[in-house]
Structure formats: structure tokens, C-alpha cells
Interface confidence: low
């Protein structure tokens, strides 16, 4: 493929290969400038598969902290307001790059790690399995 | 709190301070072993706000593609299969983590960077805003 | 209206190589991913590979990896495949393709052939 | 890699439904998108449903596309058969990396 070429002022890396371990500055830039999380916050809510957020923390995780969404009724909530177990709310769930300490307990020293997490929940039309 | 001590095996860091550069190994572990991507796979067309995938590529960032959700219209779905506009479609948003190359071309120097993805769609009742 | 012109195909012998260029009009060349397919006589269709909008990412058919090069020049709104170490089953038509999203071949040139035979 | 299995060749009479199938061999074909591509012969092939069900402007209504999770397989349906409708019938599905056709089904409106 098209290869862009390397920067002369990158800093130097004794192992070229991949995978590798490399610089990160944890500084973190937000590109979200933009965005208004207020426009977003109360989804969970009005949601016709409402959902709860949890908390789940490790020290030892960068960041420490993620928020989990767990649907609040196995199935969706009609015009009425009542459950209509017809129908079904299921987690979106999405893979993040996270960073894990490697060794443990090491300020300076992380190794990427995919996790999974469910984001919200959307209400979909269930699988129907028909007996032959 | 509790003070985990420093590991004594841990890579020597000029700096001590937050934010600090750090070394990530990008070989990355994947925690998702137990998970089945077949069950969340197809929510997208079966939701009652059903959205579109679409690829986002960035060759300056790591994870350099990442899918976009766009929702397929502005209301949902309702029983008979139609468009319900008393319903709104709306995106789940998440914050995510990524590493940007920094410099720019870099393979070996990366800063975090937070950006704003939306993982899916999700059907809310919507806010009326009534006219005095 | 979306127009794709494929040039650069003929007989070639194996081993040899050849350039294929697609001339682009009636879009934004560089806000779309590209695509080559191949079709065999009388056979099936056959993804070949694939480059993102700003030429930054490179996609391959494992049949083609190390021999094949697709490149693009925004500028000339072309899209180019470098063939080299050519083989007999190489031999098809040749169509460049514009991405409605990755992997969904939205609109297709007319196609250019390449033959390889001694 | 995966692989997508089409009947070799389907026939109907005018004014009647067929409806063609794909199956993937391996992988959940609910993951990505299928699409699917009319080719006459001696033309370049052309799209005819993309995102499993979605048609672009200008083909009729009389073709629709669907895909059943349970058998890892979608499917092209053409109602109203027309005579212009034969012509070879390509799905076609994709990971991150590769895109994949199946292998083509031939329609004879009888």
C-alpha cells in the first residue's frame, strides 16, 4: 500500500516490528468541542428501552472508569407506558481500546486491552424460533 | 485510599508527573473472549430505529478505522412497519479513546485523544415544546 | 452523472506487467473509496482491491497481495492498479468501481481487458 | 476467508416471483452488509439492493432483499418477472479487509 512517510523528528524506537511498544502522551486532546452532552444525557430515559448506567471502576484500567448500560425491562415500553414483552430491549455494545498497567501497579507502563461495553439499549423485534 | 505500591520491575520514567508520556505496548488482549458478536450483530436492521454503518478512516489514528452509526430515519418503527414521527431516532453517543500520531507520520509516538462516536440508535419520546 | 473510464488493458505475456488507470468524472473523486474487480471469461465476479478517499489505506485479495498496487492521484481524479509478475489466471476484464460505503461497489466503469499468454 | 454460495441458475416465467439465495459459509452474514448486482450480458454489473434491503433510485420495487439470521443466508426476491430481468445475479458481503462475491446465479425468465 501507499506508505506516508516517517517524520524526521519522531523519536526513536528500538524495535521497528509490530506489535511494539511505543510513546503515548497521556495528555488527552478532546475533539468533541463541539458536541453538547446535555443533547444525549436524558436518552436513557426517554427511551423506549430505558436503560441504567453503572459504574465500573479499575484502578489498574486507564481510564479507571467506564459506565455500563444495563436494559432496564426485558422488553419495551409501549405508547401506554406499560412493558410490551413483544418486543425487546438488548444492549448496543461496542469494543474500546482501553489502556491496562503491565506490569500491575506500574505508573508509566500500559499494554492496549479491548473491552467490551454496552452504551445504551435499543428496543428490536425479537427472533422468533417456530417449532416444525 | 489504599496505595498500591510500585512494582519494582516497572520501566524507569523520566517523568513523574500527570500528564506524562508513557510506554503502551500495542499488542493488544482482547477481553471479549466469552462474548458472542452474533447475538448484537444484526440489532441494526432489526431495531425499531434501525441505522447504517459507515467507516471512518483515519490513518493518522489507532484504531485507524472505526464504524460510524447513522440512524436510518427520524422517527422508528412501529408495529405495522412504517415510520412513526411521534418517535424520534436517535443516536447513541459514546466517548472513546484513541491514540493520534504525534508527530504527525509517526510509528513509534502517539498523544490520547478523546473523540465522540455513535455507536448505535436508540427510540425516545420526544420533547414537545408547547407555544404559549 | 457518475462516469468511470478504465484504459491500460492488452495482451501481456506472464511475468510481464501492465498499468491499468481509471479516469473519474462526475463526483468528488477524493471524498470516495475505490475499488477494483476482475471477471474472468465466463466466470464470476472477483474482488481485487480497494483504497480509502485520501489514498492512505490499501485493501487486497489474497490472490493479488504483492503483486498488485492500487494507488489513486486525487488531483488527475484517477485511480491506478499496478500489475506485476502477471499470471494466466490473471487474465479477465478489469472493472474500477466507486464505494457508496466500504465494500458496496455503487457505481462500475465499463471494464478493461487484459489477457496473459505466451 | 468466507464464501457465499448461490444456486449456478434459477428459471421462472414472466409475470411470476423467483427468489435467489446466498449463504455465507462462515461468520455471522448479519454483521455486514449484502448486497446484490444485476449483470447483462456483455455489461458491466450494475446495483440492484445494497444494505441488505435498500434499492437505489431508478430500480423498480419489484425487487426487495432480506436476510435470515437463524440460516446465514439473504435473498434477492424479483416479483412481477419480467423478460429484461435475466441476466446473472451476484451477492456480496465484506469484513474490514475483504470484500467477497458469491458465485453468480443465472436467470432465465422463460
Known amino acids: 500500500g501507499i506508505t506516508i512517510p516517517r517524520n524526521p523528528g519522531c523519536p526513536n524506537s528500538e524495535d521497528k516490528n509490530f506489535p511494539r511498544t511505543v510513546m503515548v502522551n497521556l495528555n488527552i486532546h478532546n475533539r468533541n468541542t463541539n458536541t453538547n452532552p446535555k443533547r444525549s444525557s436524558d436518552y436513557y430515559n426517554r427511551s423506549t428501552s430505558p436503560w441504567n448506567l453503572h459504574r465500573n471502576e479499575d484502578p489498574e484500567r486507564y481510564p479507571s472508569v467506564i459506565w455500563e448500560a444495563k436494559c432496564r425491562h426485558l422488553g419495551c415500553i409501549n405508547a401506554d407506558g406499560n412493558v410490551d414483552y413483544h418486543m425487546n430491549s438488548v444492549p448496543i455494545q461496542q469494543e474500546i481500546l482501553v489502556l491496562r498497567r503491565e506490569p500491575p501497579h506500574c505508573p508509566n507502563s500500559f499494554r492496549l486491552e479491548k473491552i467490551l461495553v454496552s452504551v445504551g439499549c435499543t428496543c428490536v423485534t425479537p427472533i422468533v424460533h417456530h417449532v416444525a | 485510599g489504599i496505595t498500591i505500591p510500585r512494582n519494582p520491575g516497572c520501566p524507569n520514567s523520566e517523568d513523574k508527573n500527570f500528564p506524562r508520556t508513557v510506554m503502551v505496548n500495542l499488542n493488544i488482549h482482547n477481553r471479549n473472549t466469552n462474548t458472542n458478536p452474533k447475538r448484537s450483530s444484526d440489532y441494526y436492521n432489526r431495531s425499531t430505529s434501525p441505522w447504517n454503518l459507515h467507516r471512518n478512516e483515519d490513518p493518522e489514528r489507532y484504531p485507524s478505522v472505526i464504524w460510524e452509526a447513522k440512524c436510518r430515519h427520524l422517527g422508528c418503527i412501529n408495529a405495522d412497519g412504517n415510520v412513526d414521527y411521534h418517535m424520534n431516532s436517535v443516536p447513541i453517543q459514546q466517548e472513546i479513546l484513541v491514540l493520534r500520531r504525534e508527530p504527525p507520520h509517526c510509528p513509534n509516538s502517539f498523544r490520547l485523544e478523546k473523540i465522540l462516536v455513535s455507536v448505535g440508535c436508540t427510540c425516545v419520546t420526544p420533547i414537545v415544546h408547547h407555544v404559549a | 452523472e457518475v462516469q468511470l473510464l478504465e484504459s491500460g488493458g492488452g495482451l501481456v505475456q506472464p511475468g510481464g506487467s501492465l498499468r491499468l488507470s481509471c479516469a473519474a468524472s462526475g463526483f468528488t473523486f477524493s471524498s470516495y473509496a475505490m475499488s477494483w474487480v476482475r471477471q474472468a471469461p465466463g466466470k464470476g465476479l472477483e474482488w481485487v482491491s480497494a483504497i480509502s478517499g485520501s489514498g492512505g489505506s490499501t485493501y487486497y485479495a489474497d490472490s493479488v497481495k504483492g503483486r498488485f498496487t492500487i494507488s489513486r492521484d486525487n488531483s488527475k481524479n484517477t485511480l491506478y492498479l499496478q500489475m506485476n509478475s502477471l499470471r494466466a489466471e490473471d487474465t479477465a476484464v478489469y472493472y474500477c468501481?466507486?464505494?457508496?460505503?466500504?465494500?458496496?461497489?455503487?457505481?462500475w466503469g465499463q471494464g478493461t481487458m487484459v489477457t496473459v499468454s505466451s | 476467508n468466507f464464501m457465499l454460495t448461490q444456486p449456478h441458475s434459477v428459471s421462472e416465467s414472466p409475470g411470476k416471483t423467483v427468489t435467489i439465495s446466498c449463504t455465507r459459509s462462515s461468520g455471522s452474514l448479519a454483521n455486514y452488509y449484502v448486497q446484490w448486482y444485476q449483470q447483462r450480458p456483455g455489461s458491466a454489473p450494475t446495483i440492484v439492493i445494497f444494505a441488505n434491503n435498500q434499492r437505489p433510485s431508478g430500480v423498480p420495487d419489484r425487487f426487495s432483499g432480506s436476510i435470515d439470521s437463524s440460516s446465514n443466508s439473504a435473498s434477492l426476491t424479483i416479483s412481477r418477472l419480467k423478460t429484461e430481468d435475466e441476466a446473472d445475479y451476484y451477492c456480496q458481503t465484506y469484513d474490514p479487509y475483504s470484500v467477497v462475491f458469491g458465485g453468480g446465479t443465472k436467470l432465465t425468465v422463460l
Open positions: 468501481a466507486r464505494d457508496l460505503i466500504w465494500g458496496v461497489a455503487g457505481s
